[in-house]
Interface confidence: medium
């Protein structure tokens, strides 16, 4: 009975040609959508002139189909029981699932101005930047279309920089026709408890972005976990989007299309300051913005973004300290809408439904030498957008799953 089932499961979750797991792993059978909500700034002049609170109004969803491309360069290594691959990126706009078009305009922080003023802090260089910012008619805020903001536009200020720099700016630029990886994961042939766990990412076992244990690449990519998941487990996974490994804990039993699944959620503790969660000390990389590592709920990933002052948080600064959201008006965090969860079928370890939610923010600081930033009296971590990437097992696949897996066990 149970032993036979365990044996069958162990065989079918191995990542090699011919297994159920492999077929769904190479190309996900689930439709994955990424919804974007853009934070449209309502009072750009008041902020720039008076250092007022930034009033934002979220606009969305703008929906794209993602993760529809099969993994590439899939290569088995029989010697160390791993399989390596590239995960290609692609996004297709879905007008019927969106509130508007890719041509919709938004008032957002000027990404290039904020980034350049942060990266180049030398006073003389800032005077030159100021000259170029004025010459290009750039300002603290800009109006951009959705397509430009997400996928890239030629920045007029950077275009004037007299030495070679990338003049194209976009929150996800470059995206289409690029790939994430190389990932090398254990295929589970020799040890099923290691299946899908990442051995190396881009040829390394650590990231070089963080100190100590924070820099480790832990767990899987969250698409699946080793089988026979227990409620007491802490599920580790790595997300290249946020340049770190993170973890999820059991929250509740959920019935998904007749399949019993465990809902694992990212707990607030994962976003806590080192004061509350000492394990997070190595995610605090500087003392000023973090107020001596007492702020929480935002992650400075600038090291992972060529020095650009990108901060990742949960949407609407859910689980973030009050000082982070205080300069921003118009945010309404709530767990139901803004937390991340994974619904995992415990026998196979497959993630059958998920909602990955995150917010992209940019730091902008006052600058005496840069005219469009010189009236600011405080630092702002400015929300640009938040996203909700979701996938749910299809009805047909759910029927198959029920009959072949959960049905046999029950």
């Amino acid at each position: 009975g149970d032993l036979l089932i365990q044996k069958t499961i162990k065989k079918q979750v191995v990542l090699e040609e011919g297994t159920i797991a492999f077929k769904n792993w190479v190309k996900t059978g689930t439709e994955v959508y990424r919804q974007f909500w853009i934070f449209d700034v309502q009072n750009p002049q008041e902020v720039m002139m008076n250092s007022s609170n930034i009033q934002v109004k979220q606009r969305g969803p703008y929906t794209y189909r993602v993760r529809f491309l099969a993994k590439e360069n899939v290569t088995q290594d029989a010697e160390d029981n791993t399989v390596s691959f590239l995960q290609p990126n692609g996004a297709i706009f879905e007008p019927s699932l969106s509130v508007g078009t890719e041509a919709d305009n938004f008032t957002v922080l000027n990404l290039a101005v904020a980034a350049a003023s942060h990266i180049y802090q030398n006073q003389f260089v800032q005077m030159i930047l100021n000259s170029l910012i004025n010459k290009s008619k750039s300002s603290m805020f800009q109006v951009r279309t959705l397509r430009e903001l997400l996928w890239g536009y030629r920045d007029p200020f950077l275009s004037l920089v007299p030495y070679p720099v990338t003049t194209t700016v976009g929150l996800f630029y470059p995206y289409n026709n690029t790939a994430d990886g190389v990932y090398k994961v254990f295929n589970g042939k020799d040890n099923i408890s290691k299946v899908a766990i990442i051995d190396t990412y881009k040829g390394k076992r650590n990231l070089s972005y963080w100190e100590s244990h924070c820099d480790m690449i832990n767990g899987t990519d969250a698409a699946s976990f080793p089988p026979f998941v227990e409620k007491s487990q802490v599920l580790q996974f790595f997300s290249s989007d946020i340049c770190r490994s993170i973890y999820a804990v059991f929250e509740s039993d959920v019935n998904l299309k007749g399949i019993p699944v465990y809902r694992f959620v990212l707990p607030s503790k994962a976003f806590a300051s080192p004061v509350e969660n000492p394990d997070n000390y190595c995610f605090c990389t500087e003392k000023i913005i973090s107020k001596n590592c007492t702020s929480y709920g935002v992650l400075d990933i600038s090291k992972c973004k060529e020095g650009r002052p990108v901060y990742i948080s949960l949407p609407h600064f859910l689980y973030a300290s009050p000082d982070v959201s205080e300069p921003i008006d118009g945010l309404n965090p709530n767990e139901e809408e803004h937390r991340t969860y994974l619904d995992i079928e415990p026998i196979t370890g497959f993630t059958l439904q998920f909602a990955k939610r995150l917010q992209v923010n940019l730091l902008v600081k006052p600058s005496e030498k840069i005219q469009v930033l010189k009236n600011l009296k405080r630092n702002y971590i400015v929300p640009i957008l938040w996203l909700n990437e979701t996938g749910t097992i299809g009805d047909e696949k759910a029927n198959m799953f029920r009959s072949q897996v959960t049905g046999k066990i029950n």
Epitope: Q42, N43, P44, Q45, M48, M49, T107, N130, S131, L132, N134, K135, K137, S139, V143, Q371, V372, L373, K374, N375
Partner: antibody
Amino acid sequence: AVTLDESGGGLQTPGGALSLVCKASGFDFSSYAMGWVRQAPGKGLEWVAGKAKDGGGTAYGSAVKGRATISRDNGQSTVRLQLSNLRAEDTGVYYCAKSAYGDWFYGSSGPYADSIDAWGHGTEVIVSS
Amino acid sequence: ALTQPSSVSASPGETVKITCSGSSDSWYGWYQQKSPGSALVTVIYDSTNRPSSIPSRFSGSTSGSTGTLTITGVRADDEAVYFCGSFDSSTDSTAFGAGTTLTVL
């Protein structure tokens, strides 16, 4: 052709309020920022107020800040300037101005006066008791 | 405020240059007024852009913090006061020059 017609000027009393209206035609009004510029007798030009195409960005000149309100009605293709607590130094010709763009380009505390591509004929305001 | 010469003069057919100095790299608009209190006409906006109704003899340029309006082959009906407009970062305010009176001899 672009036409901007101002109205509402005339003799005003100190401490009172005025309301000037600019009626636009000959272009897609909702696509352009609009503003007001004034000229005191025998003097140069002075920025009064500006508003972005969608009504979002608003800016006022330092001499009228706190006393002026600019509003626009894209359906009617009009932009209105209301000025309260009138003073003698508010006397002058008030011109309606159209930006070449959807918003004014802003410096650290006000817009650049460099992108006006059309003007009204002006309406004269005299503040006197 | 922006600094421009109070007056310039030229004979018909000559080239006239009117300058406007700001306090940093900037952009300029040039506005023509034929008599005080009368209508204004934009001859150049954004330093170099000429409205379609303005003859090609009017052109604009910038170098550093100075904007220049050039009238090539000046004509009698170009006689007017020319105001420049920009932003003055020394006073942190929207600014116009005091105006340059062009006299065609």
